[in-house]
């Protein structure tokens, strides 16, 4: 494939990467599900500067983010390192919450109202931001 | 790497007290919900408490409600079992456990006899 | 308190032959479900989280399936090191509760 060089419509870019803000709600798998058919993955926050650019477009509206620990360890759908990156929970969380009577705890994060982070049920069909690197190479076979 | 280390076990008279600590390492441990699970000899798994990360969740088992205390100090990086009124059936090994058990102590042994 | 039952209590098996372990649950826990692995002397392992999910670094011989009030755990091709014994737990209501294990020994 060749490298990516410029967003694909209606994504936007941003410090070498490109990203794409849903309008409607999905549940987190599902929305994981989607970043990846697109060739991208859900967001995936790094740095403070990353986290003000996701929340400004996304407004005070809940959104996932790739980031989960269904599996035990927290984790990023990147692969980026959880316990040396950038973290930005609201106060009091990660709960895991079992409260909620939808069985199970909370496993999925997901950006607030305020933009700070919160466990959620992965079920809940909240908004979602897919993120692609500009300089990884595209799937696509180079035009000949 | 994750690293659980209890200590704090030992023998005790019924009624006693015991305070168990578990010291952890190498993960976020605030980001984590913690656990205490104990197995008495020769039988299987049972759990005893949780506690969220910032402790605004706390659960008991039944048979320990209102003789045990759950707690942790997310600056020390560490989780606490506070054991009042023992009785004889409390003998066990207790064990740490991060969050479903991905992570696990190498066990504390608590023995309450007269 | 949802209640695990977990069959047979003991399986004997020869190694390279495949294991089959079974958990059911009083009422349905969805996908809530994990496995661990206990030797004598040694904390438990999870192996299986989500009722399908392998745990880090976990061998692909482990795999488990299921969902709601019926699970299994099969190991395929035994090797000597997983001769243990095996516990189901759920994780779908308070309190979380474990099933009683099944011991895989040596035949």
């Known amino acids: 494939g060749s490298e990516r060089t410029c967003c694909p419509v209606n994504w936007v870019e941003h410090e070498r990467s490109c990203y794409w803000f849903s309008r409607s709600g999905k549940a987190w798998a599902d929305a994981d599900n989607y970043c990846r058919l697109e060739d991208a993955h859900l967001v995936v926050v790094t740095s403070w500067e990353e986290q003000k650019f996701v929340q400004h477009h996304i407004g005070p509206v809940n959104t996932w983010m790739g980031l989960h620990d269904q599996n035990g360890p927290w984790k990023w759908v990147d692969g980026t390192d959880y316990e040396t990156g950038f973290k930005n929970w609201r106060p009091e969380q990660p709960d895991d919450w079992y409260g909620h009577g939808l069985g199970g705890g909370e496993d999925c994060a997901h950006f607030t109202d305020d933009g700070r982070w919160n466990d959620d049920v992965c079920q809940r069909p909240y908004r979602w931001v897919c993120e692609t690197e500009l300089d990884k190479a595209s799937q696509e076979p180079p035009l000949l | 790497e994750v690293q659980l280390v209890e200590s704090g076990g030992g023998l005790v008279k019924p009624g006693g007290s015991l305070r168990l600590s578990c010291a952890a390492s190498?993960?976020?441990?605030?980001?984590?919900?913690m656990n205490w699970v104990r197995q008495a000899p020769g039988k299987g798994l049972d759990w005893v408490s949780s506690?969220?990360?910032?402790?605004?969740?706390?659960y008991y088992a039944d048979s320990v409600k209102g003789r045990f205390t759950i707690s942790r100090d997310n600056a020390k990086n560490s989780l606490y079992l506070q054991m009042n009124s023992l009785r004889a059936e409390d003998t066990a090994v207790y064990y740490c456990?991060?969050?479903?058990?991905?992570?696990w102590g190498q066990g504390t042994l608590v023995t309450v006899s007269s | 308190e949802i209640v695990m039952t977990q069959s047979p209590a003991t399986l004997s098996v020869s190694p390279g032959e495949s294991a089959t372990l079974s958990c059911r649950a009083s009422?349905?826990?969805?996908?809530?479900l994990a496995w661990f692995q206990q030797k004598p002397g040694q904390a438990p392992r999870l192996l299986i989280n989500?009722?399908?999910t392998r745990a880090t670094g976990i061998p692909a011989r482990f795999s488990g399936s299921g969902s709601g009030t019926e699970f299994t755990l099969t190991i395929s091709s035994l090797q000597s090191e997983d001769f243990a014994v095996y516990f189901c737990?759920?994780?779908?209501?308070?309190?979380?509760?474990f099933g009683q294990g099944t011991k895989v020994e040596i035949k």
């Open positions: 456990a991060r969050d479903r058990g991905s992570g």
């Open positions: 190498g993960f976020t441990f605030s980001s984590y919900t």
């Open positions: 506690i969220s990360g910032s402790s605004s969740y706390i």
């Open positions: 009422q349905t826990v969805s996908s809530n």
């Open positions: 989500g009722a399908s």
């Open positions: 737990q759920q994780y779908h209501d308070w309190p979380p509760t």
